[in-house]
């Protein structure tokens, strides 16, 4: 049994962080394999992550941290049964990947305008709460050219665009992501989206 | 606005205890993690223990490890630390801080005034 | 464990002088660095994080720099209330360790 793709992980953070290799060959990576993590300082406890099939020889690793801070730094060994297949080691604070934002919600009750507003995905308490910045995805449901991203370089987690910049009479849907600066994270995954039907008309002078 | 307040110091012979208390108020106390930092009589600042939020992770300097323990209860919005077979050397002026971000276990934004640790025969 | 040397250990300064104090630490820690002033008598308070970060309340004529394993703490106009000790924390890996302190006294 060989690591075709050593394990490369990222953290969100706080309690989770997300650990995936490839295999040599087809496996049962639940069955067949263990993740052991232990925090590097004196003799830390030794946790047991059971992987998941990512693909025919893709498997996952959901980690379990108790509170991530800066100053963690885990060594990581992949065991098959009795057999080490790699070793390696994981500092959660410089391989970052943010959680997904959530409630993603269009308004377009201002007769011009569409606002969309959506939630950060931490808590206040977090460091990353005031650091990240969004990217919503805009596109036309019947025309998949008809795509746009908007970057929200702001902290407030909005959106305002004017309804005229979008065709009328059709539907769209919206999709945000995020990133921390001070952190350079990865891009989070993509939030779900939503949709909404564009009844603008532009003014009758106008048309 | 966070408050820690400290108690339990005292005169205490070597080999003896002490259980040192900090009462907290004004933040989300399950939330984070929480530190004693300890000053020797006109010496500098020394990390003494951190639990975790949780509390499932808790973490020493080696001058104390193995005879101090840090505990915390979240019901409580209290953090201890019990200190075992005492050494002159750990005459100090004990503090409870709590770090300014819950992803930082230093980077100490609030501080208690400090309970006075006095180890002597 | 990483060790935070700060220098110089003391200093006499005038008002109104600039003041520099600088911290090494002895592998890198990114920007995982905090800078604090104790008053005699007193609690330490927080006056820099993240290297570069002033805390909120903090005068503005305190400003941190650095990255890596070289970090300034810069006062740009000392004030009579400056009078203290400061020290460095690096908060990138355990142990957490603080520099051995500097103390400031006004000329």
């Known amino acids: 049994m060989k690591v075709l793709q050593e394990p490369t992980c990222v953290s969100d953070y706080m309690s989770i962080s997300t650990c995936e290799w490839k295999m040599g060959g087809p496996t049962n990576c639940s069955a067949e394999l263990r993740l052991l993590y232990q925090l590097v300082f004196q003799s830390s406890e030794t946790h047991t992550c059971v992987p998941e099939n990512n693909g025919g020889v893709g498997c996952v690793c959901h980690l379990l941290m108790d509170d991530v801070v800066s100053m963690d730094n885990y060594t990581l060994d992949l065991w098959a049964g009795q057999q080490l297949l790699w070793k390696g080691s994981f500092k959660p604070s410089e391989h970052v990947k943010p959680r997904a934002p959530g409630n993603l919600t269009v308004h377009t009750n201002v007769s011009d305008t569409v606002l969309l507003t959506w939630s950060n995905p931490y808590p206040p308490d977090n460091y990353l709460y005031n650091d990240l910045t969004y990217a919503v995805n805009i596109w036309n449901e019947n025309d998949l050219a008809d795509s746009r991203i908007h970057n929200v370089t702001y902290l407030k987690p909005t959106l305002r665009i004017p309804a005229s910049t979008l065709k009328s009479g059709i539907s769209y849907r919206a999709r945000v992501r995020a990133w921390a600066q001070h952190y350079n994270t990865t891009w989070s995954e993509w939030s779900p989206s939503t949709k909404w039907y564009n009844s603008y008309r532009e003014p009758f002078e106008q048309r | 606005q966070v408050q820690l307040q400290e108690s339990g110091g005292g005169l205490v012979q070597p080999g003896g205890s002490l259980r040192l208390s900090c009462a907290a108020s004004?933040?989300?106390?399950?939330?984070?993690?929480l530190t004693w930092v300890r000053q020797a009589p006109g010496k500098g600042l020394e990390w003494v223990s951190t639990?975790?939020?949780?509390?499932?992770?808790?973490l020493y300097a080696d001058s104390v490890k193995d005879r101090f323990t840090i505990s915390r209860d979240n019901a409580k919005n209290t953090l201890y630390l019990l200190m075992n077979s005492l050494k002159p050397e750990d005459t100090a002026v004990y503090y409870c801080?709590?770090?300014?971000?819950?992803?930082?276990?230093?980077?100490?934004?609030?501080w208690g005034q400090g309970t006075t640790v006095t180890v002597s025969s | 464990d990483i060790q935070m040397t700060q220098s110089p250990s003391s200093l006499s300064a005038s008002l109104g002088d600039r003041v520099t104090i600088t911290c090494q630490a002895s592998?890198?820690?990114?920007?995982?660095l905090a800078w604090y002033q104790q008053k005699p008598g007193q609690a330490p308070k927080l006056l820099i994080y993240?290297?570069?970060r002033l805390q909120t309340g903090v005068p503005s004529r305190f400003s941190g720099s650095g990255s890596g394993t070289s970090f300034t703490l810069t006062i740009s106009g000392l004030e009579t209330e400056d009078l203290a000790t400061y020290y460095c924390?690096?908060?990138?890996?355990?142990?957490?360790?603080f520099g051995q302190g500097t103390k400031l006294e006004i000329k």
């Open positions: 801080a709590k770090p300014l971000y819950n992803n930082f276990a230093g980077h100490f934004g609030s």
């Open positions: 004004g933040f989300t106390f399950s939330s984070y993690s």
């Open positions: 639990i975790k939020a949780r509390g499932g992770t808790t």
């Open positions: 592998q890198s820690i990114s920007s995982y």
């Open positions: 993240g290297g570069s």
């Open positions: 924390q690096q908060d990138y890996s355990w142990p957490l360790t």
